[in-house]
């Protein structure tokens, strides 16, 4: 039988999503945060 709760808040329960990681420091060293000079 199909036991997984499938429609809680419209999304399957038990399915782990995988977001893309965010790197706010962009092209700088991970310890620094600087936006390109054109801004």
């Amino acid at each position: 039988s199909y036991s997984m709760e499938h429609f809680r808040w419209g999304k399957p329960v038990g399915k782990k999503r995988r977001p893309v990681k965010v790197y706010p420091n962009g092209a700088e060293d991970e310890s620094a945060e600087a936006f390109p000079l054109e801004f």
Epitope: R17, V20, Y23
Partner: antibody, heavy 115, light 110 residues
Framework: QQQLVESGGGLVQPGGSLRLSCAAS?????????MCWVRQAPGKGLEWIGC????????YYPTSAKGRFTISRDNSKNTLYLQMNSLRAEDTAVYYC???????WGQGTLVTVSS | DIQMTQSPSTLSASVGDRVTITCQAS??????LAWYQQKPGKAPKLLIY???TLKSGVPSRFSGSGSGTEYTLTISSLQPDDFATYYC????????????FGGGTKVEIK
């Protein structure tokens, strides 16, 4: 300063294959990063092609890219790859590699599919 | 699959104008949304992530808001350097086609 440099673009005939490279400097690809490929057809918008978790090697693709496109990495060369097969005219685009969601993108490499 | 619908596709404005760009997701993306600016012949630059977090160094005239499926990028007072194309991107779920871009909004001089 972290940098990404793509190469390998050029003219290819329909049905052909091409492998693009993305050389990273200023950071080590073998650390766990999400590295992605995005393309942009001439005069059009951005299209996500897929990403690789450089730690595990797990890859993720949109439905449109599954089957024809393969992302890989060579940790010893600190380089990311995009293998493209069965190329079509509509694959003509500038191909960018990017470090996850960030401002760290390469300059792009143009792929032209034409006979 | 998550679709991102961005509007308008083109926006004509003048320096000093308040500009608003919207992005609608086909499902709840829980604020996993980024905004990029792109100029001709250049790679995109990240402006905002987490729907509303301004990247360090980005001018405060840029702001992002929204939740659920509706998101907005606002430029409070348009500057000459801001004429460019803007894209939203969700990064909600790579495993389920959930890293797609909106179609883009070109902000041009009126």
């Amino acid at each position: 300063q972290q940098q990404l440099v793509e190469s390998g673009g050029g003219l290819v005939q329909p049905g052909g294959s091409l492998r693009l490279s993305c050389a990273a400097s200023g950071f080590t690809v073998s650390d766990t990063y999400d590295m992605c490929w995005v393309r942009q057809a001439p005069g059009k918008g951005l299209e996500w092609i897929g990403c690789i978790d450089t730690g595990s090697g797990d890859t993720y693709y949109p439905t449109s890219a599954k089957g024809r496109f393969t992302i890989s990495r060579d940790n010893s060369k600190n380089t990311l790859y995009l293998q493209m097969n069965s190329l079509r005219a509509e694959d003509t685009a500038v191909y960018y590699c990017a470090k996850g969601v960030s401002s760290l993108w390469g300059q792009g490499t143009l792929v032209t599919v034409s006979s | 699959d998550i679709q991102m619908t961005q509007s308008p596709s083109t926006l004509s404005a003048s320096v000093g104008d308040r500009v608003t760009i919207t992005c609608q997701a086909s499902e709840d993306i829980e604020s996993d949304l980024a905004w990029y600016q792109q100029k001709p012949g250049k790679a995109p630059k990240l402006l905002i992530y987490g729907a509303s977090t301004l990247k360090s160094g980005v001018p405060s005239r840029f702001s992002g808001s929204g939740s659920g499926t509706e998101y907005t990028l606002t430029i409070s007072s348009l500057q000459p350097d801001d004429f460019a194309t803007y894209y939203c991107q969700t990064y909600y779920d790579m495993a389920d086609d959930g890293a797609s871009f909106g179609g883009g909004t070109k902000v041009e001089i009126k």
